[in-house]
């Protein structure tokens, strides 16, 4: 999951590069100063920007909580990727939180699929082939968001 | 934190006007640009005007182009937008969006946005 957040307490370190912007827009990797006239590079490993912007502030890198690993670490132009851990996985309709996979299937049915960091495991029917989705334990540990959602997927 | 509030919605006749306001309560937008995005049921969000905080230079989509009108007040650190001669189709939940994203630097139209407020609902019926 990306979150990110505009951190306008951070401001850019002197040796940081600067550039001009194009038609009032920064690259990624960049933001704008107040004056518009600079584009100024995000901090390796601590901030980022994914697209042309005029942020004042490039974006928080996102810390994966505990009850997640980190796949990707964060670049100047891409965010944290954070996995829910093994053993655990996150559903799109509840983000927000790792659940823990089921440990089997009920009596008469046969798994299909493992527990993945996206998906529970998968159970049929042994008969019939019809999937059976239980309900699922919440891990105590809940993934926190930072407020507003990008528009576009920041990945 | 960036916060973004608006008003000024409401329920209103075929060519009647609204204003929206936008006030960011965090005392910073977090960009130079602020915009104004739509969105009807089922649909995705719409870009509908955008403006440059610094030099006042706006943005309009093409369905919007001579009926809104996007303004700021940097003083009060609101971005406004005057709505005229409204159609039924106007009616959605009308976004105020900062931190705008675009692919391409010469992009008038932004592809998203990092922060977004609430939303503001408009009705037009005929």
């Known amino acids: 999951i990306t979150r990110q957040s505009l951190d306008p307490q951070r401001r850019a370190a002197p040796q940081q590069k600067r550039s001009s912007p194009t038609e009032g827009l920064c690259p990624p990797g960049h933001h704008i100063s107040e004056d518009s006239r600079e584009c100024i590079s995000c901090k390796y490993g601590q901030d980022y920007s994914t697209h042309w912007n005029d942020f004042l502030f490039c974006l928080r890198c996102t810390k994966c909580d505990s009850g997640e690993v980190e796949v990707n670490s964060c670049t100047t132009t891409r965010n944290t990727v954070c996995q829910c851990e093994e053993g655990t996985f996150r559903e799109e309709d509840s983000p927000e939180i790792c659940r823990k996979c089921r440990t089997g299937c009920p009596r008469g049915m046969v798994k299909v699929k493992d527990c993945t960091p996206w998906s529970d495991i998968e159970c049929v029917h042994k008969e019939s082939g019809t999937k059976h989705t239980g309900e699922v334990p919440a891990v105590e540990k809940t993934v926190t968001t930072s407020p507003g959602t990008p528009a576009s997927p920041c990945s | 934190e960036v916060q973004l509030v608006e008003s000024g919605g409401g329920s209103v006749q075929a060519g009647d006007s609204l204003r929206l306001s936008c006030a960011a309560s965090?005392?910073?937008?977090?960009?130079?640009?602020v915009g104004w995005f739509r969105q009807t049921p089922g649909k995705e969000r719409e870009f509908v005007a955008a403006i440059n905080r610094n030099d006042g230079t706006t943005y309009y989509a093409d369905s919007v182009k001579g009926r809104f009108t996007i303004s700021r007040d940097n003083a009060k650190n609101t971005v406004y937008m005057q709505m005229a001669s409204l159609k039924p189709e106007d009616t959605a939940v009308y976004y105020c969006?900062?931190?705008?994203?675009?692919?391409?630097?010469?992009?008038?139209?932004?592809?998203?946005?990092?922060?977004w407020g609430q939303g503001t609902q408009v009705t037009v019926s005929s």
């Open positions: 965090g005392r910073t937008f977090g960009s130079i640009r």
């Open positions: 969006a900062a931190g705008l994203q675009y692919n391409r630097s010469a992009d008038r139209v932004p592809v998203g946005a990092v922060y």
